[in-house]
């Protein structure tokens, strides 16, 4: 179902109407947007008393509503993803059209602990009670709705429109029907106060065609922060009425001639302004023509005024709205300034901490201090940064270079560096040779030795074996050795697993789940495996599987 | 109390699905969200994704590309995790956890973790 | 993503000694956001500190938290034989939430 505007209140700046429709939060939202307005706010009693108005309008217009308990959507709502805070007053929840955290809340009960879901906010009424100032709708979350869906109770929304100024209702001074047509598609005979850029038509007369007369005028800025209509004096004025008629349409006095004629006055301290019937303050402070926490000053005499703005603002412009003044201009921050709202702060860079000699300095943070080196081994400092680096045999990893990763000689880039088999160890590796073979005094090669069938020589050490779990060799992989790069090994190493590279099948290993613990690694049992067969660390789910290899002598450590 | 009761270890083959459950009692199962999260010795803890039973609205650890299922069914209080396409570093210890009364994704409440091996 | 970098990866401290567990994150995390938990050998996590500071519903007072932005810490005032286990801190600033890489702590 649509929505129609059954309600309409305007007062300060802003007007709200009330539509009654069963839809979403999102369609009530669009509905108001059409119009360039937005679910209303009630960021205060004030403002909830206004709402709660133009609703009492709409119920008494609205006979159909279908639930005791109805809902009516407001702007208040809770992105997907964004927790439920009960250390604010909104609770986590912000207005629609943007705007600060405002202190003033009227939850119906204990908000729902949620963040995966949107969540959005309804007024609560109780259509069994009168609406009374003294009790203000109630605030109730719930999911948002859906398009024919809304929610449960969900009977409608509340849209908030808002404006530079308002213009005064026109004045009658005669029998007459004044309609009014706001900016937001909404027709009214009966305003308060009238938006900027609202039509007015002013039919003149008592419904007898012939003496009706039509005058048209628009609600304009005629000057800053100034709105009036541009008419002249009480329109449908009757020398039959005279004063009798809506006070002859005047503010304040009325005072008639002896012909019927009719003049507006204003009582003492008042002045009459153009149009001939409004009256103001003499008082040009009365009308609180300073913005934004501006106070008004008044001139010698009271005959003017000037806005004063409070420490950290200044006038803009207008000179009567105060603006934030940006003190970081004048660089008062060694490294990064902040601009406040009437101040503002110093921080610094990531790497660095407030200290050192002057206001708003900052000193490098020394990340390779005892007990805070985020670096697996080896850690330097640097100005606003660090860098790891590793012993050799390993080379930097992780995500951030921080970590350090045994480098498997058996896989190296330049094939096996062993002829036959190859067990790589933490840091190091070491060779050794299948059943049948010894290992040459090279440390490399493999010569003919007597004929064993017992597992291949150089296993894991008893040491190793709670490390990195080996097994033997299987019986059937009796192929020659095939002859690595030549080459001696960089150091006399201890065993770990073993690779062998042989046209052996390629054996998958059974991965030994350990409890978890603050670095885990990448524990197999040794395989038989082609040169090019390298095992390894496995892709994480949706990882990149890709692992740059770094060099030894360091790397920039993120932070 | 707040429980939560899983499923039993599973051994799945390389390519296939698997479903683990989670049986909640001791509250109302649609007032608090769930969530799954996995251990593997190599990647440690991992946020897999989580579920409002009120509304059915999920998120997801977007690391897992699309394989991650989480529902709910109301009626059984119970919550759903399915991954498919499953590989051998899907080998892990699965937890349901929640995080109750608490606020901030403080997650109060674990099940007893079911684990699966992928192999083939 | 935000990164969770704990350190040491292990501790070894005797009975009665001060343990210092650190987590750094890659970006600023609000300190309502990043919590800490214990895991026993063979047991599901056990959530220990929330919010930075807060100890969770058991919790003995030797256990306490601190820190903000992108550092923050936990602390075991004097370390019990009971407290041999790995732990890990969490963070969330938007999905994905994430855990750090554990930091085990054993008794000398």
């Known amino acids: 179902t649509g929505a129609d505007t059954e309600a309409v209140v305007c007062v300060g700046t802003a007007c709200y109407t009330a539509h009654s429709g069963k839809l979403s939060a999102a369609e009530a939202q669009n509905h108001c947007n059409q119009n360039g307005g937005n679910l209303a706010t009630v960021k205060s009693k004030e403002e909830a008393q206004h709402v709660q108005r133009v609703l009492a309008q709409l119920l008494r217009r609205e006979a159909a509503l279908t639930a005791r308990m109805s809902k009516f959507w407001i702007g208040l709502q809770r992105e997907k993803g964004k927790c439920l805070d009960p250390s604010l007053p909104l609770k986590g929840f912000s207005w629609v059209g943007g705007g600060e955290d405002t202190p003033y809340s009227n939850w119906h009960k204990e908000l729902r602990n949620s963040c995966i879901s949107k969540r959005c906010v309804s007024l609560l009424l109780d259509l069994s009670q009168p609406l009374l100032p003294s009790r203000l709708p109630k605030w109730s979350e719930g999911p948002c709705g859906s398009p024919g869906s809304p929610g449960s109770n969900i009977e409608g929304f509340v849209c908030k429109f808002s404006f530079k100024g308002m213009c005064r209702p026109l004045a009658l001074g005669g029998p007459g029907q004044v309609t009014y047509t706001t900016p937001f598609q909404t027709t009214s005979s009966s305003l308060e106060a009238v938006p900027f850029a609202s039509a007015a038509n002013v039919a003149c007369g008592e419904g007898d065609k012939d003496e009706t007369q039509s005058h048209y005028f628009l609600c304009k800025e005629k000057a800053p922060d100034v709105f009036d209509w541009g008419s002249s004096g009480p329109l449908c004025v009757s020398p039959k009425y005279g004063c009798n008629f809506n006070n002859g349409g005047c503010h304040q006095d009325c005072f008639e001639g002896g012909d019927g004629s009719f003049l507006c006055g204003c009582r003492p301290g008042f002045r009459l302004l153009d149009d001939l019937v409004t009256c103001a303050s003499r008082n040009p402070c009365s009308s609180s023509p300073c913005r934004g926490g501006a106070t008004c000053v008044l001139g010698p005499h009271g005959k003017n005024y000037t806005c004063r703005c409070p420490q950290g603002y200044q006038l803009d412009s207008s000179q009567l709205d105060c603006v934030d003044v940006d003190e970081c201009q004048d660089s008062p921050c060694a490294q990064e300034c902040v601009n406040t709202p009437g101040g503002f702060r110093c921080e610094c860079w990531v790497g660095y901490e407030p200290g050192g000699p002057g206001e708003g300095a900052c000193q490098d943070v020394d990340e390779c201090a005892l007990g805070r080196s985020p670096c697996a081994q080896g850690c330097t400092n640097t100005d606003g940064s660090f860098h790891c680096s590793c012993e050799e045999g390993y080379v930097l990893a992780g995500e951030d270079g921080t970590q350090c990763q045994d480098v498997d000689e058996c896989v190296g880039p330049g094939g096996p560096l062993c002829d036959s088999l190859c067990f790589n160890t933490q840091g190091s590796f070491h060779c050794g040779c299948l059943p049948g073979w010894v290992l040459a005094p090279n440390g490399v090669s493999c010569t003919m030795g007597p004929v064993s069938l017992g597992p291949p020589s150089g296993p894991p050490d008893e040491e190793d074996k709670g490390e990195k779990e080996g097994s033997t060799v299987p019986r059937a992989a009796t192929a020659s050795p095939t002859r690595g790069p030549e080459g001696t090994p960089k150091a006399t190493p201890t065993t770990s697993r073993p690779s062998l590279s042989s046209d052996a099948p390629i054996t998958s290993a059974p991965l030994k789940m350990l409890a978890p613990s603050g670095s885990p690694g990448v524990w197999r049992e040794p395989s038989i495996h082609h040169a090019t067969a390298a095992s390894g660390p496995q892709e994480p789910a949706g990882g990149d599987s890709s692992v740059a290899t770094q060099n030894n002598d360091g790397t920039d450590g993120q932070k | 109390q707040v429980q939560l009761q899983q499923s039993g270890a599973e051994v799945k083959k390389p390519g296939s699905s698997v479903k683990v459950s989670c049986k909640a009692s001791g509250y109302t199962f649609t007032d608090y969200e769930m969530h799954w999260v996995r251990q593997t010795p190599v990647y440690g803890l991992e946020w897999m994704g989580g579920?409002?039973?009120?509304?059915?609205?999920?998120a997801y650890n977007q690391n897992f590309k699309g394989r991650v299922t989480i529902t709910a069914d109301k009626s059984t209080s119970t919550a759903y995790m399915e991954l498919s396409s499953l590989r051998s570093e899907d080998t892990a210890v699965y937890y349901c956890?929640?995080?109750?009364?608490?606020?901030?994704?403080?997650?109060?409440?674990w099940g007893q973790g079911t684990t699966v091996t992928v192999s083939s | 993503e935000i990164v969770l970098t704990q350190s040491p990866a292990t501790l070894s401290l005797s009975p009665g000694e001060r343990a210092t567990l650190s987590c750094r994150a890659s970006s600023s995390v609000s300190s309502s956001y990043l919590h800490w938990y214990q895991q026993k050998s063979g047991a599901s996590p056990r959530l220990l500190i929330y919010s930075t500071s807060n100890l969770a519903f058991g919790i003995p007072a030797r256990f306490s938290g601190s820190g903000s932005g992108t550092d923050y810490t936990l602390t075991i005032s004097s370390l019990e034989a009971e407290d041999v286990a790995v732990y890990y801190c969490?963070?969330?600033?938007?999905?994905?939430?994430?855990f750090g890489g554990g930091t085990k702590v054993e008794i000398k």
């Open positions: 969490q963070q969330y600033s938007g999905y994905p939430l994430t």
């Open positions: 579920i409002d039973p009120e509304t059915g609205d999920t």
């Open positions: 956890t929640n995080y109750g009364n608490l606020y901030y994704y403080a997650m109060d409440y």
